[in-house]
């Protein structure tokens, strides 16, 4: 099918960075300034994204790829292709409608984004609290009395931090 199409459609020969110009007998013309085509055989070039205002340019637009944006310091990207900027908070806080608020007792957040998560419940694993939790850090679970035999491991590190409650980037 591809071979048949290329025989019939001269536009299929136009590479990325060009478009098939119907006004010029389907000649492959370069994309105009501030536009791009990321695949071959395009009949038009797409307008480059402009990273304006709080959206900063992370990667300039080229004839074959769109610009990429990120957010001004104090905010971070959210959504596909950094379609939104969301406020940073301090460690030990989470973002709410009312702005950044401290984590409630018994919860923590060790990042500038995401939500406060409950401290690990050491007793569920039959362990004791070795280091108390804070707003910024999870508890560290230590051995249960039965684990204090020679050669036993003395500390269980906390589970790796996850970041629930936010759209993927």
């Amino acid at each position: 099918f591809e071979r048949t199409r290329s025989l019939q459609d001269p536009c299929s020969n136009c590479p990325a960075g060009t478009f098939c110009d119907n006004n010029r007998n389907q000649i492959c013309s370069p994309c105009p300034p501030n536009s791009f085509s990321s695949a071959g055989g395009q009949r038009t070039c797409d307008i480059c994204r402009q990273c304006k205002g709080v959206f900063r340019t992370r990667k300039e637009c080229s004839s074959t790829s769109n610009a990429e944006c990120d957010c001004t310091p104090g905010f971070h990207c959210l959504g596909a292709g950094c379609s939104m900027c969301e406020q940073d908070c301090k460690q030990g806080q989470e973002l709410t409608k009312k702005g950044c608020k401290d984590c409630c007792f018994g919860t923590f957040n060790d990042q500038k984004r995401g939500i406060c998560r409950p401290w690990t419940n050491c007793s569920l694993d039959g362990k004791s609290v070795l280091v108390n939790g804070t707003k910024e850090r999870d508890v560290v679970c230590g051995p249960s009395p039965a684990d204090l035999s020679p050669g036993a491991s003395s500390v269980t590190p906390p589970a790796p931090a996850r970041e629930p409650g936010h759209s993927p980037q």
């Epitope: 939104m84 969301e86 759209s167």
Partner: nanobody, 123 residues
Framework: QVQLVESGGGLVQPGGSLRLSCAAS????????MNWVRQAPGKGLEWVAN????????YYVDSVKGRFTISRDNAKNSLYLQMNSLTAEDTAVYYC????????????????WGQGTTVTVSS
């Protein structure tokens, strides 16, 4: 196209007042949370205030509570920020920003931003 245009900035003396406006076009203004965000010289962005679609909920950063008032007029597609008792710390570029789809539910991201209006508080 979708656009936000701020106005009303300027030079004001400490203790003075200003009212910022933001004119929205190209989208259904009454369907979105709206925000004011500012950037002081040499600093990062700071969220200032937000307002729900119908104006029934309004929230402020602690440093402006009792001095700034956010409001909106959905009939005029306009957002406002009344700023009283201004101090030098309020000197900044003020941006109007639209809360993205799902704002307040699973995120607080802002997807459309104005070009900003400059407020300078100085004697």
């Amino acid at each position: 196209q979708v656009q936000l245009v701020e106005s009303g900035g300027g030079l004001v003396q400490p203790g003075g007042s200003l009212r910022l406006s933001c004119a929205a076009s190209g989208f259904t203004f009454s369907s979105y949370w709206m925000n004011w965000v500012r950037q002081a010289p040499g600093k990062g962005l700071e969220w200032v205030a937000n307002i729900k679609q119908d104006g029934s909920e309004k929230y402020y950063v602690d440093s402006v509570k009792g001095r700034f008032t956010i409001s909106r007029d959905n009939a005029k597609n306009s957002l406002y920020l009344q700023m009283n008792s201004l101090t030098a710390e309020d000197t900044a570029v003020y941006y109007c920003a639209r809360g993205g789809e799902g704002y307040g539910d699973d995120h607080y991201g802002m997807d459309v931003w104005g070009q900003g209006t400059t407020v300078t508080v100085s004697s």
